[in-house]
C-alpha cells in the first residue's frame, strides 16, 4: 500500500449564487485526518491520531492552504455557466501518493453534483473526461476558466503536486503513520433471529492497516460467501478501522462455529459465547 494524502473540497451554489462556506476533508493513508467545515475554516485534526502526527503546533499553515483552495474552487464554480435553480455542488479531489519504490503519483478530479466530469494527472498534465455530453460541456467550461486564470497555470499545477507530496512527507516524518500495525479487538455476539435460529456477529475493531480477513467457519471449514453478511471496513475515528461479519446458525450448534480473523500475518479464532441470548432482533445486523 502506498502512503497517500487526499484532499476533498466541496463548494455549493444556490440558485446560481455561490455560497460562502465550503467543506474540506483531508485523509492521510485513507484515514480522516483534517477537516474544515465552518464558514471560517479552522483546520481540526480528526482524533488523537491526527494530533499525534501534527504534534504540538497550531494548524495555521493547513488552515491557510485549505482556505485558499476553497476560494479557488468557489471561483471555479462561479464560472460554471449551466447552473440551474436549486442546490448544486462542485467537488475537487486531489490525491498524491508515495509508493514503496519512492515513485510518486498525483491526480486531481472534479465532480459536479456528485458526477465526475474532469480529471488531471498532475505529473503528466494530461486531462481526461468521461464521454457524456454533459461532462464534456462542464469540462470545457472549467478548463477554459482554469486557462484564463493566471493562478492556474502549469506552474500552479506543478506546485499543487509538489506541495501535496511535501505535506505528505512532512506528516510521514512524525513516524506515527509509518507502517504501524495495530491488532484488532475481536468480539462475538449472538442474537435471536427466528424460531430455532440465532444470528452470530463477529466484530473486529481498532485495527490498522485496513486489510483484514474475517469469516465464519463451521468445524474449521469456511462457510460459503453467500451465507455470510459482511460490513464495510470503516474508519472508527481513531486512526484505525472496524468491520463485522454475521451468519445465521441453528440454536444449539454454537460450539461448532468460530470466527476466524487474520490481520497483518497474525490470526486467531473466536468461539460463539454460550449461554443466554444477549440481544433480541429479528433481522440481519
Amino acid at each position: 500500500e502506498p502512503h497517500s494524502l487526499r484532499y476533498n473540497l466541496t463548494v455549493l451554489s444556490w440558485d446560481g449564487s455561490v455560497q460562502s462556506g465550503f467543506l474540506t476533508e483531508v485523509h492521510l493513508d485513507g484515514q480522516p485526518f483534517l477537516r474544515c467545515d465552518r464558514q471560517k475554516c479552522r483546520a481540526k485534526p480528526q482524533g488523537q491520531w491526527a494530533e499525534d502526527v501534527l504534534g504540538n503546533k497550531t494548524w495555521d499553515r493547513e488552515t491557510r492552504d485549505l482556505t485558499g483552495n476553497g476560494k479557488d474552487l468557489r471561483m471555479t464554480l462561479a464560472h460554471i455557466k449551466d447552473q440551474k435553480e436549486g442546490l448544486h455542488s462542485l467537488q475537487e479531489i486531489r490525491v498524491c501518493e508515495i509508493h514503496e519504490d519512492n515513485s510518486t503519483r498525483s491526480s486531481q478530479h472534479f465532480y459536479y453534483d456528485g458526477e465526475l466530469f474532469l480529471s488531471q494527472n498532475l505529473e503528466t498534465k494530461e486531462w481526461t473526461m468521461p464521454q457524456s455530453s454533459r461532462a464534456q460541456t462542464l469540462a470545457m467550461n472549467v478548463r477554459n476558466f482554469l486557462k484564463e486564470d493566471a493562478m492556474k497555470t502549469k506552474t500552479h499545477y506543478h506546485a499543487m503536486h509538489a506541495d501535496c507530496l511535501q505535506e505528505l512527507r512532512r506528516y510521514l516524518k512524525s513516524g506515527v503513520v509509518l507502517r504501524r500495525t495495530v491488532p484488532p479487538m475481536v468480539n462475538v455476539t449472538r442474537s435471536e433471529a427466528s424460531e430455532g435460529n440465532i444470528t452470530v456477529t463477529c466484530r473486529a475493531s481498532g485495527f490498522y492497516p485496513w486489510n483484514i480477513t474475517l469469516s465464519w467457519r463451521q468445524d474449521g471449514v469456511s462457510l460459503s460467501h453467500d451465507t455470510q453478511q459482511w460490513g464495510d471496513v470503516l474508519p472508527d475515528g481513531n486512526g484505525t478501522y472496524q468491520t463485522w461479519v454475521a451468519t445465521r446458525i441453528c440454536q444449539g450448534e454454537e460450539q461448532r462455529f468460530t470466527c476466524y480473523m487474520e490481520h497483518s500475518g497474525n490470526h486467531s479464532t473466536h468461539p460463539v459465547p454460550s449461554g443466554k441470548v444477549l440481544v433480541l432482533q429479528s433481522h440481519w445486523q
Epitope: 463451521q218 468445524d219 474449521g220 471449514v221 469456511s222 462457510l223 460459503s224 453467500d226 451465507t227 441453528c250 450448534e253 460450539q255 461448532r256 476466524y260 487474520e262 490470526h267 468461539p271
Partner: antibody, heavy 122, light 106 residues
Framework: EVQLVESGGGLVQPGGSMRLSCGAS????????MNWVRQAPGKGLEWISY????????YYADSVKGRFTISRDNAKNSLYLQMNSLRDEDTAVYYC???????????????WGQGTMVTVSS | DIQMTQSPSSLSASVGDRVTITCRAS??????LNWYQQKPGKVPKLLIY???TLQSGVPSRFSGSGSGTDFTLTISSLQPEDFATYYC????????FGGGTKVEIK
C-alpha cells in the same frame, strides 16, 4: 455404532452417469458436515466435494466441478453424489467421510465409510 | 487452489526409528492442517487435527507441529503397526490432501 456405508458403485461407460449414496447411522447425521473423497487404484487420496449440515455451503474440487453434484437428505440420514459426464480418470474407490465436530476442529474427517468402487471403462 | 506438497514421497525406516514427514502448503493456511494414516486395503484414520492436536485414541508417539506453510508429522519411535501411508490435508481454503508419504520397512 457410528457408521457410514457407501453404495451405488459399479461399471459405467465414459460419458455416462452414476449416483452414489452414503447411509449414516449411530450419530445425528443432520448436525454434521460431510464429504466425498476418492482414491484411484494405487494413488493418493483426493478430496472431491463438501456439504455442510444445512446444505448452504457446498464446495467441489476443480476436477469434478460442473460434472458432480453433492446433496443430502437429513430426514433419510443420507448423503449423495450425482456423477455425470464420467471419464476414465474418475475410476476410483469413493469414500464418504464425516467432518469431526470436536471443539477446535480444522475440517478433519473422523469417520470414513468402507468405500464403493466406481469403474469408468468402455 | 492451495497445493499441499508432502516429502519425502516414500521412506524406509526400522522399528524404533524417529520418523519425520513434512507437508508444505502453497500459501499460508494458519493451523488448518490435519494428518491421516492409511494402511493397505483399509480406510484412512485421523491422527492429528489443527496441526498439533492428537485425535482421541491415537498413541502419543505421534506428534504434529507447524503453522503457516510448513508442517511436520513426527513418529518418535516407529512401531510395526506404523508402516503405512500418511497424508496431510488442509481446510483453510476449501479442502485438499497432500500426495502422501509411504513409510516402508527397511
Amino acid at each position: 455404532e457410528v457408521q457410514l456405508v457407501e453404495s451405488g458403485g459399479g461399471l459405467v461407460q465414459p460419458g455416462g452417469s452414476m449416483r452414489l449414496s452414503c447411509g449414516a447411522s449411530g450419530f445425528t447425521f443432520s448436525s454434521y458436515s460431510m464429504n466425498w473423497v476418492r482414491q484411484a487404484p494405487g494413488k493418493g487420496l483426493e478430496w472431491i466435494s463438501y456439504i455442510n449440515s444445512r446444505s448452504n455451503t457446498i464446495y467441489y474440487a476443480d476436477s469434478v466441478k460442473g460434472r458432480f453434484t453433492i446433496s443430502r437428505d437429513n430426514a433419510k440420514n443420507s448423503l449423495y453424489l450425482q456423477m455425470n459426464s464420467l471419464r476414465d480418470e474418475d475410476t476410483a474407490v469413493y469414500y464418504c467421510a464425516r467432518v469431526s465436530a470436536i471443539t477446535g476442529n480444522t475440517g478433519a474427517f473422523d469417520i470414513w465409510g468402507q468405500g464403493t468402487m466406481v469403474t469408468v471403462s468402455s | 487452489d492451495i497445493q499441499m506438497t508432502q516429502s519425502p514421497s516414500s521412506l524406509s525406516a526400522s522399528v524404533g526409528d524417529r520418523v519425520t514427514i513434512t507437508c508444505r502448503a502453497s500459501q499460508s493456511i494458519s493451523s488448518y492442517l490435519n494428518w491421516y494414516q492409511q494402511k493397505p486395503g483399509k480406510v484412512p484414520k485421523l491422527l492429528i487435527y489443527a496441526a498439533s492436536t492428537l485425535q482421541s485414541g491415537v498413541p502419543s508417539r505421534f506428534s504434529g507441529s507447524g503453522s503457516g506453510t510448513d508442517f511436520t508429522l513426527t513418529i518418535s519411535s516407529l512401531q510395526p503397526e506404523d508402516f503405512a501411508t500418511y497424508y496431510c490435508q488442509q481446510s483453510y481454503s476449501t479442502l485438499t490432501f497432500g500426495g502422501g508419504t509411504k513409510v516402508e520397512i527397511k
